[in-house]
Every structure is written in structure tokens, then in C-alpha cells.
């Protein structure tokens, strides 16, 4: 099933537009902004949900140092031109002829330039740190049953497999969910790290991308895990390249 | 070839304690997600427990309620299942059985099975 | 939680002929569903995982179907090597279930 046959709608994207137009009368469903066929039975990738989000009418110590190469999407949302497999293409320009490299994950990791920049490859992201805060509660919650239920949801809400899940780590108030999957781990049919860490990151905004399904409710032995503040560092395969005036 | 091998099972008093071992061979354990299942004569299957090696990550079925505690021991490939204050209602063959290595739950390698009999 | 309320037992089928075991969850579970067939003394078999596909060595006149909440198992051409108790089960959580197994359902093949 790509979509749900019975009223032909996107189980895993709720931008999309679907109608029975596919082979033999089955559901298809087209990613907004892009018009790109989705499979309904996994994540649709970040770039095709940026583009459609775009297009959208505007509404408005255990713990992990991240390394000195680790970036933070500080730019915000853009309009990204997507390849036709659905991924970031490695150069992204906006309509003032400015442009700039991205990674897989579409977060900028080059100074801006012009249509002169060359963007050689698209480049990794292996290694991505999901920063939480969550609100104050009775007590801290146990570090193995907390470990436990992220790394359900990861795997039952996401589709990630736990083996891509590489650390939970967890000092009151903050939770660090650790995501790696280097290009050589990353078999056909896995869901992307960083597709997986989006649509977390759209959950815990309470802008969740499923259709028709409730909202995230994260729960630790019944007691409800409420994110206060989320920060999301992204690791490359390769060092992004800035100036070193952006690093003073 | 992969295998999987149940022990530990007998015959118990009720109130008694008992510990099941599940023996894994020809793959590599940590790779894969394990489960108990249980079937009391004549009845269907019921799930106990189900754990990732790797992480130590556990789940229960709501009705366990603490009474069986299931862990591992990776590094001599063995899965383990306490059973703990038994009554006659837990009799039954105890499968452990591995998933797929997917993200569903579904268990395509099965072990014989080991008996569990409470009685007095 | 979800529950998982299967066919009720004993099911007939004539050899050569074509038997369906219904399947359903009290709660959409995708196409998250596994089929399994257990025979006396034996543990259970997987035979359909994700609702439809044929798990490795299983004959393809199984054939699963369904999404959501109503799940059928079809054996086509059956032999009297089906006979048979059935089992569907939700493959998508772990999390606050009583059992992910459906009750089973019995086969004979006269």
C-alpha cells in the first residue's frame, strides 16, 4: 500500500494531495509545492516537506558537548530545490541569485555566495544531536525506561530502527537522543536520520506531519514527558567550510 | 544456522521461581530484538516480553505486572526469563522467538519451546 | 491498546479448495500485521508479514490483505498439509499491550 486505499488519503504526509490515479485505480499521492509521487508507507523526505511547507498559505555532564563542526539551522525556513529521488541538491540559490551549499539534511554549511559557488557533493549528515528540556516533573524520570520509550518511538512512530538510535543520554532537566547513520550503514528501505529528527522535531512543535494521527504523546511509565526547549545540532561527514569571520 | 533454544523449564510449586534461558546461535544477537511468548495447553499465544539486546531496551505485556523480568547476556548470546510468585495459570510451553531485524515486530525465528508446569 | 479479534474457530476447507481468516484491530495498525501457522507440537511459523508479503520458503498460495483494521488471510488450492491454527498479529507496538496476538483460528481440511 503506498496510501489507504479506503479514502485515498497519505498516512505519513498530510501535505499531500491524493487521488486513485495510480496503476489498476490504487491511491497516489503527490507532495505539495513539488507535485512529487510519495510512498505513503515511510517519512517523505525533509526537502520535499520543506518545499510543501513553503508552498502552504503562511500561518504563523553525561550529556553531550557538541563539536566545534556541529551546526545549528540558524537560517530558518527556505524554499529548496529538491532532486528527483526527493533529497536536498547540494547547492541551493534564492531568487536573488544568492547561493550557498547545504548537507543532507538542508542545513547551510558554507558562507553565502554567488552563482559562482560550486557545490561539489552533497554532504552527510551522520551524526545528528537532539538537545531537549523538558518541563519540571515530581521527580527525574529513570534513564533506562526513558531510554527505552524514545527508542520505541524512534522505531514505531518514525520507522527508525533502533540501531540508528546510538545513545539516549539524560541529566534532569535535559535529554540528548543521539542519531547516527553513516552512508555505508544506511541499507535501502531505512528511513534518513535526518527525515526522522524532522518530523520529531515537527511532533514536538505540536505541528505533527502524519494525517489523521493524534499528536505525539510521550509518556514514561504514564507520566507525561513535556518538551519545554528543543535544539538540534547536525555533524557532517566532512567539515563544513565557513569563513572565519562567521566563527568569532 | 540460526537457531534458538529454550531451557530452564519444569516442573515449579505454586508461589515458586523459575528461570528460562533461550540459547541463540548462527547470527548475530545484537543485531536483533527478542521476544517470550507463552501457549497454555490448548489455548492460544500470548506475549511476555520483548527486549533489544543491544540497548538493554525493554517492554512488557500489561498483564506481567512485575511478576517476570526479561534480560539478556550478549556476550554468550543467551536470553533470559525470570518467573517469579507462579500460579497454575502460568502453565505453559515458553517460546522465545527473534524478529526480523525490521522495524515491525514481527517473529520469524521460533525455538521449540520449553514447559512450565505449576503444580502442587 | 490494541486488540486483536480473529475468525472464529474451527474454519472448514475442502482440499483444492480456497479458506479466508478475517482479522481485525481496535485500532488502525497500517499495514503492520503478521500471519503465523502453528501446527501440534510445533512452534509457529511466520507466513505474511506488512499485511500482504510472503515471508521466505512460504508457498504462495498463502496470500495476506488489508489495511487499518480489517485484515484477511487467503490459502488457495488447499492441501491437507494446512490443517492448522492460525495466528494474526500486530506488528507495529510493544508499547501498553495486553497481547498482539489475535485468539487464532483452527483449520480443517476434509
Known amino acids: 500500500h503506498t496510501a489507504a486505499q479506503d479514502n485515498c488519503t497519505c498516512p505519513t504526509n498530510k501535505m499531500t494531495v491524493c487521488s486513485p490515479d495510480g496503476p489498476g485505480g490504487r491511491c497516489q499521492c503527490r507532495a505539495l509545492g513539488s507535485g512529487m509521487a510519495v510512498d505513503c508507507s515511510t517519512l517523505t523526505s525533509k526537502c520535499l516537506l520543506l518545499k510543501a511547507r513553503m508552498s502552504a498559505p503562511k500561518n504563523a555532564r553525561t550529556l553531550v558537548r557538541p563539536s566545534e563542526h556541529a551546526l545549528v539551522d540558524n537560517d530558518g525556513l527556505y524554499d529548496p530545490d529538491c532532486d528527483p529521488e526527493g533529497r536536498f541538491k547540494a547547492r541551493q540559490c534564492n531568487q536573488t541569485s544568492v547561493c550557498w551549499c547545504v548537507n543532507s539534511v538542508g542545513v547551510r554549511r558554507t558562507d553565502k555566495g554567488d552563482l559562482s559557488l560550486r557545490c561539489d557533493e552533497l554532504v552527510r549528515t551522520h551524526h545528528i544531536l537532539i538537545d531537549l528540556r523538558h518541563r519540571p516533573t515530581a521527580g527525574a524520570f529513570n534513564h533506562s525506561d526513558l531510554d527505552a520509550e524514545l527508542r520505541r518511538l524512534f522505531r514505531e512512530r518514525y520507522r527508525l530502527h533502533p540501531k540508528f538510535v546510538a545513545a539516549v543520554h539524560y541529566e534532569q532537566p535535559t535529554i540528548q537522543i543521539e542519531l547516527r547513520q553513516n552512508t555505508s550503514q544506511k541499507a535501502a528501505g531505512d528511513v534518513d536520520i535526518g527525515d526522522a529528527a524532522y518530523y520529531f522535531e515537527r511532533d514536538i512543535k505540536g505541528e505533527s506531519l502524519f494525517q489523521g494521527r493524534g499528536g505525539l504523546d510521550l509518556r514514561v511509565r504514564g507520566e507525561p514527558l513535556q518538551v519545554e526547549r528543543t535544539l538540534i545540532y547536525y555533524l557532517d561527514e566532512i567539515p563544513p567550510k565557513f569563513s572565519m569571520k562567521r566563527l568569532t | 544456522q540460526e537457531q534458538l533454544k529454550e531451557s530452564g523449564g519444569g516442573l515449579v510449586q505454586p508461589g515458586g521461581s523459575l528461570k528460562l534461558s533461550c540459547k541463540a546461535s548462527?547470527?548475530?544477537?545484537?543485531?536483533?530484538?527478542v521476544s517470550w511468548v507463552r501457549q497454555a495447553p490448548g489455548k492460544g499465544l500470548e506475549w511476555i516480553a520483548y527486549i533489544y539486546p543491544a540497548f538493554h531496551n525493554t517492554y512488557y505485556a500489561t498483564w506481567v505486572n512485575g511478576r517476570f523480568t526479561i534480560s539478556s547476556h550478549n556476550a554468550q548470546n543467551t536470553l533470559y526469563l525470570q518467573l517469579n510468585t507462579l500460579t497454575a495459570a502460568d502453565t505453559a510451553t515458553y517460546f522465545c522467538?527473534?524478529?526480523?531485524?525490521?522495524?515491525?515486530?514481527?517473529?520469524?525465528?521460533w525455538g521449540p519451546g520449553t514447559l512450565v508446569t505449576v503444580s502442587s | 491498546d490494541v486488540v486483536m479479534t480473529q475468525t472464529a474457530s474451527p474454519v472448514s476447507a475442502a482440499v483444492g479448495g480456497t479458506v479466508t481468516i478475517k482479522c481485525q484491530a481496535s485500532?488502525?495498525?497500517?499495514?503492520?500485521l503478521s500471519w503465523y501457522q502453528q501446527k501440534p507440537g510445533q512452534p509457529p511459523k511466520l507466513l505474511i508479514y506488512e499485511a500482504s508479503k510472503l515471508a521466505s520458503g512460504v508457498s504462495s498460495r498463502f496470500s495476506g490483505s488489508g489495511y487499518g483494521t480489517e485484515f484477511t488471510l487467503t490459502i488457495s488450492g488447499v492441501e491437507c498439509a494446512d490443517a492448522a491454527t492460525y495466528y494474526c498479529?500486530?506488528?507495529?507496538?510493544?508499547?501498553?499491550?495486553?497481547?498482539?496476538f489475535g485468539g487464532g483460528s483452527e483449520v480443517v481440511v476434509k
Open positions: 485500532q488502525s495498525i497500517y499495514s503492520y
Open positions: 548462527g547470527f548475530d544477537f545484537n543485531k536483533y530484538g
Open positions: 522467538a527473534r524478529d526480523a531485524g525490521t522495524t515491525d515486530y514481527n517473529f520469524n525465528l
Open positions: 498479529q500486530q506488528a507495529l507496538t510493544v508499547g501498553n499491550v495486553d497481547n498482539p
